[in-house]
Interface confidence: medium
């Protein structure tokens, strides 16, 4: 199959809001741990039909192994389980969510796993080169997303210890071949690439050699061009409010967006006793918006002070680029400062947003 | 605003060759599936085959494998579908199709192209 | 292939009439992996419903899909004028990807 078809890879981790999209996921899991994936459809629709892959084969279900059109779960991992995890749409193989997965043996701290791979003293008095980890070099083509990190490793030893040193499609590669350079980590046999761009494709190889031989191997590298998408507004923000009469409060809005994202704090009110104009259009007041002055992370809160019963009501955030536009809304709830009172006697606390 | 426009009708002859045309706009081209989906006079829908712009992937139906050939050029935005010889039986509307984000459903269609093939 | 029935072939129906439309696979359809389209004459089809039962952006609350396995429908609480046109069902839970023959709502 053909992995040019890996575009818009979007990771998500179950429980807990993804990356934004064009994210490979990096999770670690200690031993023994149930791995979750997650993997919704963008919008919150049906997905089309899905198979899940590791390694690049297709997982089949079993007593541990659980297997969902949205969701994986291995239980009981093991350092076996570690591995490049996809949610594909089966027909045209395309990857939807893509996941690497670490088993480690204690609870992770999530480190890069660089100086795994030194040269070693492997007890051979002399040697030609050979690979140490050949497992860790199934992955021949790469397909990843413009701006991410891309890291080739050839794990190798030899009596000698051997040199390694990298092409591109079949030419001397070097630092000032490449807008941001390269790092070549020799004691880790790789070779790093920081914010991948499109003119990063083609073929790598690594060339291992001492005087006993040579071996090489050849990775292909596509970049991804982002695809646009409207703003995403953060799960659960704004949260709903309950605030006392007089006290102040703060709604607070997240927005990922690759174009530069417009944002305005928005009220609703009635007009006429309704609430929607003709149209269905809700009637809503302005109540904050980009200025001269405002900046992107002042326009994601919304204070209130010394709020009154006025104040309560739906308020949304609205977000906008030039793809589309996107909302959420939270409800405040104003209580008179007696009741308050009267709960603070009875539960011991005040509770005010 | 998601647009597929496709190149207008076409009169053939048996035999002869041809190459209709899909441009999309509004969207990242390279990053969506297009389908091409035949109607025969008076008929239903018949799904062709698939083709990802980004590297000109493709996926055919049994029924049109070896019938037709899809491609795309990624640089103009364009799908292309193609015959090296014509048959009667090839005559129809053929409709272009974005698939969703996950590959399945057909969301944006273009207006058709109407081929006619006839001695 | 995963062969779709669909059932009634017309239907004649006046403008404010309930309609409903039937689709039915020679297979089950996994996970409700069932789409409906709209075509009217002279015009390319347009997406209505995707996952058996979700609106596609845009289309009315009259629309509405249900169904799962081997039989699915299509029902418009409130017939249009616009309404009157050819439906057709898709499966894409198996390749190769198939429609229905269509049911052709007609004004009565």
């Known amino acids: 199959e053909s992995l040019g078809t890996e575009q818009r890879v979007v990771g998500r981790a179950a429980e807990v809001p993804g990356p934004e999209p064009g994210q490979q996921e990096q999770l670690v899991f200690g031993s023994g741990d149930a791995v979750e994936l997650s993997c919704p459809p963008p919008g919150g629709g049906p997905m089309g039909p899905t198979v899940w892959v590791k390694d690049g084969t297709g997982l089949v279900p079993s007593e541990r192994v659980l297997v969902g059109p949205q969701r994986l779960q291995v239980l009981n991992a093991s350092h076996e389980d570690s591995g490049a995890y996809s949610c594909r749409q089966r027909l045209t193989q395309r990857v939807l969510c893509h996941f690497s997965v670490r088993v480690t043996d204690a609870p992770s701290s999530g480190d890069d796993e660089d100086g795994e791979d030194e040269a070693e003293d492997t007890g051979v008095d002399t040697g030609a080169p050979y690979w140490t980890r050949p497992e860790r070099m199934d992955k021949k083509l790469l397909a990843v997303p413009a701006a991410n990190t891309v890291r080739f490793r050839c794990p190798a030893a030899g009596n000698p210890t051997p040199s390694i040193s990298w092409l591109k499609n079949g030419r001397e590669f070097r630092g000032e071949h490449r807008i941001g350079g390269i790092k070549l980590r020799h004691q880790q046999w790789s070779l790093v690439m920081e914010s991948v761009v499109p003119s990063d494709r083609g073929n790598y190889t690594c060339v291992v050699e001492n005087k006993f031989g040579s071996i090489r191997q050849t990775y292909t590298l596509d970049v991804l061009e982002r695809s646009p998408h409207r703003p995403i507004l953060q799960a659960g923000l704004p949260a709903n409010q309950t605030a006392v009469l007089g006290s102040d409060v703060e709604f607070h809005c997240k927005v990922y967006s690759d174009a530069q994202p417009h944002i305005q704090w928005l009220k609703h009110v009635e007009v006429n006793g309704s609430k929607v104009g003709p149209d269905g259009t809700p009637y809503v007041t302005v109540l904050k918006t980009a200025g001269a002055n405002t900046t992107d992370k002042e326009l994601e809160v919304l204070s209130l002070h010394n709020v009154t019963f006025e104040d309560a009501g739906e308020y949304t955030c609205l977000a906008g680029n030039s793809i589309g536009f996107s909302h959420h809304s939270a409800w405040l709830v104003v209580l008179p400062a007696e009741e308050e009172l009267v709960e603070a006697d009875e539960a011991g606390s005040v509770y005010a947003g | 605003e998601v647009q597929l426009v496709q190149s207008g009708a076409e009169v053939k002859k048996p035999g002869e060759s041809l190459k209709i045309s899909c441009k999309g706009s509004?969207?990242?081209?390279?990053?969506?599936?297009i389908a091409w989906v035949r109607q025969m006079p008076g008929k239903g829908l018949e799904w062709m085959g698939i083709?990802?712009?980004?590297?000109?992937?493709?996926r055919y139906s049994p029924s049109f494998q070896g019938q037709v050939t899809m491609s795309a050029d990624k640089s103009i935005r364009i799908a292309y579908l193609q015959w090296s010889s014509l048959k009667a039986s090839d005559t129809a509307m053929y409709y272009c199709?974005?698939?969703?984000?996950?590959?399945?459903?057909?969301?944006?269609w273009g207006q058709g192209t109407l081929v006619t093939v006839s001695s | 292939e995963i062969v779709l029935t669909q059932s009634p072939g017309t239907l004649s129906l006046s403008p404010g009439e309930r309609a409903t439309l039937s689709c039915r696979a020679s297979?089950?359809?996994?996970?409700?992996?069932l789409a409906w389209y709209q075509q009217k004459p002279g015009q390319a089809p347009r997406l209505l419903i995707y996952?058996?039962?979700s609106r596609a952006t845009g289309i009315p609350d009259r629309f509405s899909g249900s169904g799962s396995g081997t039989d699915f429908t299509l029902t418009i609480s409130r017939l249009e004028p616009e309404d009157f046109a050819v439906y057709y069902c898709?499966?894409?839970?198996?390749?190769?990807?198939?429609f229905g023959q269509g049911t052709k709502v007609e004004i009565k």
């Open positions: 898709q499966q894409y839970g198996s390749s190769p990807w198939t």
């Open positions: 297979q089950s359809v996994s996970s409700s992996y």
């Open positions: 509004g969207y990242s081209f390279t990053s969506y599936w």
């Open positions: 199709a974005r698939l969703d984000y996950s590959g399945s459903w057909f969301d944006y």
């Open positions: 083709i990802y712009p980004g590297d000109s992937d493709t």
């Open positions: 996952g058996a039962s």
